[in-house]
């Protein structure tokens, strides 16, 4: 289920300090967790609608087994959820840009 109507979707955003850790989007809210040097890191951000490709299974919403768990959702602040850290450790992916945080 996608975002409602034409109303902007409000999401938690870990990098949006000046906007009170909130971003606004026409797409989805995303939260991702990974394990780096034994530390859990959550990244929360907005994904614009144009970047939700391919339809049905957008790249930005896919988890990477043993590397990163990711959850996309479509209601205000739904990405405040905490995810379980994957069982593996973060290795350098072949295509880092695909999994990098979205600003």
């Amino acid at each position: 289920s996608g975002p409602r109507g034409v109303q902007a979707l409000l999401c938690a955003c870990t990098s949006c300090l000046q906007a009170n850790y909130t971003c606004e989007t026409d797409g989805a809210c995303m939260v991702s967790i990974f394990n780096l040097d034994g530390m859990e890191h959550h990244v929360r951000t907005c994904i614009p609608k144009v970047e939700l490709v391919p339809a049905g299974k957008p790249f930005y919403c896919l988890s990477s087994e043993d590397l990163r768990n990711t959850h996309c959702c479509y209601t205000d602040y739904c990405n405040r959820i905490d995810l379980r850290v994957p069982s593996g450790h973060l290795k350098e992916p072949e295509h880092p840009s695909m999994w990098g945080p979205v600003e």
Partner: antibody
Framework: QVQLQESGPGLVKPSQTLSLTCTVS??????????WSWIRQHPGKGLEWIGY???????YYNPSLKGRVTISVDTSKNQFSLKLSSVTAADTAVYYC???????????WGQGTLVTVSS | SSELTQDPAVSVALGQTVRITCQGD??????ASWYQQKAGQAPVLVIY???KRPSGIPDRFSGSSSGNTASLTITGAQAEDEADYYC???????????FGGGTKLTVL
């Protein structure tokens, strides 16, 4: 401490619309940080999540009930409501309202209200 | 059928330790929360997130996760712990909230 209380008719005729209201006391729906949810429990069975609303009006529904469910909020009355259309006997259940922490745990719950669908 | 699977019934001797489990693919990614429901009453949250306990819940209740299984452990079960216990989380596609079928705990 936040408390929730369900209210509405205990008997609804088949094909009609079930309407329930949850009144929140001890806290404001508008304070943010929570979803306001409806959950039901068929007699002698497990729990089924129906859907939730954020004070902004942002809603999310169980896909299995989508199309029949509408959840709305009235921040001025500190209430949120459930409407379930085209009911059948299979919708007979105890209906609970609950506050949902974003992260999907429910606390607290209302005491529940039994709604029977019968002619 | 539920996407979260629980044993229908479990029993424990008074004062002993019991573990109630909840299985599902989604639990590799999402935390489960746990609810206690006594006969004729509304459910009460007992464990949420990464083994967090709401205020007022005794410390004999604890939670853990491994692989696709979440567990609720009661260490030193009391007579008042006799109840139905439900887990909940997201479904495997992350589309909606689901509950397990429930486990009836009997304290002998």
């Amino acid at each position: 401490q936040v408390q929730l209380q369900e209210s509405g008719p205990g008997l609804v005729k088949p094909s009609q619309t079930l309407s329930l209201t949850c009144t929140v006391s001890g806290g404001s729906i508008s304070s943010g940080g929570y979803y306001w949810s409806w959950i039901r429990q068929h007699p002698g069975k497990g729990l089924e999540w129906i859907g939730y609303i954020y004070y902004s009006g942002s809603t999310y529904y169980n896909p299995s009930l989508k199309g029949r469910v509408t959840i709305s909020v009235d921040t001025s009355k500190n209430q949120f409501s459930l409407k379930l259309s085209s009911v059948t006997a299979a919708d007979t259940a105890v209906y609970y309202c609950a506050r949902e922490e974003v992260g999907d745990w429910f606390d607290p719950w209302g005491q529940g209200t039994l709604v029977t669908v019968s002619s | 059928s539920s996407e979260l699977t629980q044993d229908p019934a479990v029993s424990v001797a008074l004062g002993q330790t019991v573990r109630i489990t909840c299985q599902g693919d989604s639990l590799r990614k999402y935390y489960a929360s746990w609810y206690q429901q006594k006969a004729g009453q509304a459910p009460v949250l007992v464990i949420y997130g990464k083994n967090k306990r709401p205020s007022g819940i005794p410390d004999r209740f604890s939670g853990s996760s491994s692989g696709n299984t979440a567990s609720l452990t009661i260490t030193g079960a009391q007579a008042e712990d006799e109840a139905d216990y439900y887990c909940n989380s997201w479904d495997s596609s992350g589309n909606h909230v689901v509950f397990g079928g429930g486990t009836k705990l009997t304290v002998l």
